[in-house]
Every structure is written in structure tokens, then in C-alpha cells.
């Protein structure tokens, strides 16, 4: 019995179906086929879980979080024992193993390994201003998404003709911050943060209004 090499790793957007491949060759009839799919979740690497089991001509559930979402892609028994996972969740990310036994055919490699990464587009980011908006002050524009895998990068732009930030601004695309030093009336305006990763983008807007000093009444 020999389980074929798998592609190594699969990426899928959350909510989309994933197919985890596993095929094998055997010299025996598929009368005593036994297939166990296991996962070592990324979030809990010391606690492997059963995903689905085929034994004695019947399919059995594994961990309840896979219940109703997992099945074999084809009619069993077969030499293609790939599975599908519907409505993928972040917690499905991990290393999946198919363990195949088909007595009396023993020996050879009976395990296939495939990594699954569930990707999540950035959630709507939260934009806020830190610091005084008085003229001459320093302000920080903050932008962060609660969700996003891979971790989003953040790009700030000023929504004017140039889309450029003021010359006194410094941007950190990893942290999602823009520091604008010595703000002036020219710093006022609408700013947009674009959070993006491999599978999506999301934006938020922020209105910066620089406060000019009130003229003093001389009486």
C-alpha cells in the first residue's frame, strides 16, 4: 500500500469549501479498507482531533466542530479518500493526516499529510485620532482591523487631489499608524485607511479638522 504525495499545503478563504487530497495504490481488494483523517490544529497543537473515519464499510463522525461539514469527496470504498470541508472556519487551520489501512496489504507509506490554512479578509478597520487637534500639535492617526489572516497591512492616504499625506507625516504600514507633526490648516481634511491582505481589503474614513487659535479680544 502506498499513499501518494500530497501538494503540501492548501489555502482557502474562510467560509469557502476546501478539498484535502489523499489517494493511494494497493494490491488488495478494498474489503477491509480503514481510513482515519486526523487534524493537529494550529490553535492547539498538542491536541490532535479525529475529523472523519471510514471503517467496516461505514462513515463515522470525528470532532463535533466538523459535524455536517465534512465528507469524502467520492463514494466509498475507493482509492481516492480525499475529503471536503464545507464552510471553513479559522479553527480548521492545521495539519491534516490521512491514515490508510487495507488488510492484508501492509508495508509502504500509509500516511498522507496536507496543511490547511484558512484565510480571513480584513474586517472593517477602526479609525481614530490620538492627540490634540490644535494647530502646531502632533497627532497620530490609528487604524486597526480586529480580523485578518494573513495579518493586514494598513495604508493611509489623504483624500485630496494628490492622495499624498502631508510632508510632516510618517507612516507605519504594519502598525497602521500615521504621525503628523506640527499640524497646520493644510493638514485638515478627510483621511482614508485601507487595510489589505492576500484575499481582501477594507477601509475606514477619518475627518481631521485642525483647530486654529481664537483671536483674542483686546479690551
Amino acid at each position: 500500500l502506498e499513499v501518494s504525495e500530497s501538494p503540501g499545503s492548501i489555502q482557502v478563504a474562510r467560509g469557502q469549501p476546501a478539498v484535502l487530497p489523499c489517494t493511494f495504490t494497493t494490491s488488495a481488494a478494498l474489503i477491509n479498507l480503514n481510513v482515519i483523517w486526523m487534524v493537529t490544529p494550529l490553535s492547539n497543537a498538542n491536541q490532535p482531533e479525529q475529523v472523519i473515519l471510514y471503517q467496516g464499510g461505514q462513515m463515522f463522525d470525528g470532532a463535533p466542530r466538523f459535524h455536517g461539514r465534512v465528507g469524502f469527496t467520492g463514494t466509498m470504498p475507493a482509492t481516492n479518500v480525499s475529503i471536503f470541508i464545507n464552510n471553513t472556519q479559522l479553527s480548521d487551520t492545521g495539519t491534516y493526516q490521512c491514515l490508510v489501512n487495507n488488510l492484508p496489504d501492509i508495508g509502504g507509506r500509509n500516511i498522507g499529510v496536507t496543511g490547511l490554512t484558512v484565510l480571513v479578509p480584513p474586517s472593517a478597520p477602526h479609525c481614530q485620532i490620538q492627540g490634540s487637534q490644535d494647530i502646531g500639535s502632533d497627532v497620530i492617526l490609528l487604524c486597526s482591523s480586529e480580523e485578518g489572516i494573513p495579518r493586514p497591512t494598513y495604508l493611509w492616504e489623504k483624500l485630496d487631489n494628490t492622495l499624498k499625506l502631508p510632508p510632516t507625516a510618517t507612516q507605519d504600514q504594519v502598525q497602521g499608524t500615521v504621525t503628523i507633526r506640527n499640524i497646520s490648516a493644510l493638514s485638515s481634511g478627510l483621511y482614508q485607511c485601507v487595510a489589505s491582505n492576500a484575499i481582501g481589503t477594507s477601509t475606514c474614513l477619518l475627518d481631521l479638522q485642525v483647530i486654529s487659535p481664537q483671536p483674542r479680544n483686546i479690551g
Partner: antibody, heavy 117, light 107 residues
Framework: EVQVQQSGPELVKTGASVKISCKAS????????MHWVKQSHGMSLEWIGY????????TYNQKFKGKATFTVDTSSSTAYMQFNSLTSEDSAVYYC??????????WGQGTLVTVSA | DIVLTQSPATLSVTPGDSVSLSCRAS??????LHWYQQKSHESPRLLIK???QSISGIPSRFSGSGSGTDFTLSINSVETEDFGMYFC?????????FGAGTKLELK
């Protein structure tokens, strides 16, 4: 449209058994699981177990092992739950629920079982 | 078994109020937490799946959040049709379990 229709209310004597039916329509019956859930009067929900509508394999909550038995009839797209050796504690509304986006995606309307002395 | 503790047991509100219902798990359940609404003499209805994911046909005023052990169902501007019981349910480990419920009632 997915529909799950349960049998009507039952009044049964202590020590007897009752068999509740759950007829499904609007989808491929054998492609899903059917769960059973108990709701005692004014109480929360308790999961009894489920049956695979394709092969009849059942999984029970330890609490209800020996008390409940699940069966399916694929020709009529109907799932059944038999409850044995009934006591007053078994008086409740029993729901069947088809799996889907979650284990309990589509619910039947419930069957009231009243156990009397 | 995983125990789900819902609070408060009863919540009295006026239509138009925004409310948050809490569900706490006795151990981490990732995002394998679902919310159901049950009106008087009706079957439960799925509102939110996997802690925060919306269900087709459910009004957008219902939203969910949380992961691990602490979860929240939020109703933005309660309407009269929202009164009833709300249950959380976990699908992280067997046996599947429900919370005792929160009753949302008219003040």
C-alpha cells in the same frame, strides 16, 4: 424549501414507550444528519443525540443511552425516535433538527409528550 | 461536559434599546458557538453561527462576537418581535450543550 414536520402530541402512561416521527422534505434526506433535542417545561434545551440519515449510524448523549433509540426510513424520508420506560421526568417537548450550517440548522415544530400515571 | 453560562437570566428592555447578551463557556471552544432565538410556543431559530457569522434571512440588527470562552449576542435597536428566549449552543465537543437561556422581555 427545507421542511421538517413532526408527529402530533402524545399522552402516554408511565412505563410505556413512545415513538415520534420527523418527516423531511425539500432536500436530499440521506445527505444530512438528524438531531433530537429535549425541552422540559420552561427549561433549557438538551441534546439527545443524532442519526446519520444515509447509513443509520447513531450517536447518543451518554445521559440518554438506553432511553432513546433512533431509526430512519429513507424511502419515506422520515426519522424516528423511540423513548422507552417513560417517567414523569420524560414529559417534555421533543424536537428533531436537521444539520446544516450548524448541527441544528432547521427545526421541526416539536412534539409534546405527556407522561401520566 | 462543557457548561455554557448565560447572563443575565432576564433582560427587561424597551423597543429601540440596544442590548448585549452574554454566554460564557467552562473551557475554550474557539468560535464553535451558535445563537438561537425561541419565541413563545415556537421552535428555536438559528440567529448567528460560529460566534459572529450572520445567517441568511436574519435581520442585520443581530450580531455576535467573541472567541474562546466569552461570547456576546448584540441586538441593535430591539423590536417588539425580538422578545423571547435566547440560547447559546456549543459544537466544540461531545455532548453538544446549550446555555440555560436569557429571557428578553418588555419593560
Amino acid at each position: 424549501e427545507v421542511q421538517v414536520q413532526q408527529s402530533g402530541p402524545e399522552l402516554v402512561k408511565t412505563g410505556a414507550s413512545v415513538k415520534i416521527s420527523c418527516k423531511a422534505s425539500g432536500y436530499s434526506f440521506t445527505g444530512y444528519y438528524m438531531h433530537w433535542v429535549k425541552q422540559s417545561h420552561g427549561m433549557s434545551l438538551e441534546w439527545i443525540g443524532y442519526i446519520s440519515c444515509s447509513n443509520g449510524a447513531s450517536t447518543y448523549n451518554q445521559k440518554f443511552k438506553g432511553k432513546a433509540t433512533f431509526t430512519v426510513d429513507t424511502s419515506s424520508s422520515t426519522a424516528y425516535m423511540q423513548f422507552n420506560s417513560l417517567t414523569s421526568e420524560d414529559s417534555a417537548v421533543y424536537y428533531c433538527a436537521r444539520s446544516g450550517e450548524t448541527p441544528f440548522a432547521y427545526w421541526g415544530q416539536g412534539t409534546l409528550v405527556t407522561v401520566s400515571a | 461536559d462543557i457548561v455554557l453560562t448565560q447572563s443575565p437570566a432576564t433582560l427587561s428592555v424597551t423597543p429601540g434599546d440596544s442590548v448585549s447578551l452574554s454566554c460564557r463557556a467552562s473551557q475554550s471552544i474557539s468560535n464553535n458557538l451558535h445563537w438561537y432565538q425561541q419565541k413563545s410556543h415556537e421552535s428555536p431559530r438559528l440567529l448567528i453561527k460560529y460566534a459572529s457569522q450572520s445567517i441568511s434571512g436574519i435581520p442585520s440588527r443581530f450580531s455576535g462576537s467573541g472567541s474562546g470562552t466569552d461570547f456576546t449576542l448584540s441586538i441593535n435597536s430591539v423590536e417588539t418581535e425580538d422578545f423571547g428566549m435566547y440560547f447559546c449552543q456549543q459544537s466544540n465537543s461531545w455532548p453538544l450543550t446549550f446555555g440555560a437561556g436569557t429571557k428578553l422581555e418588555l419593560k
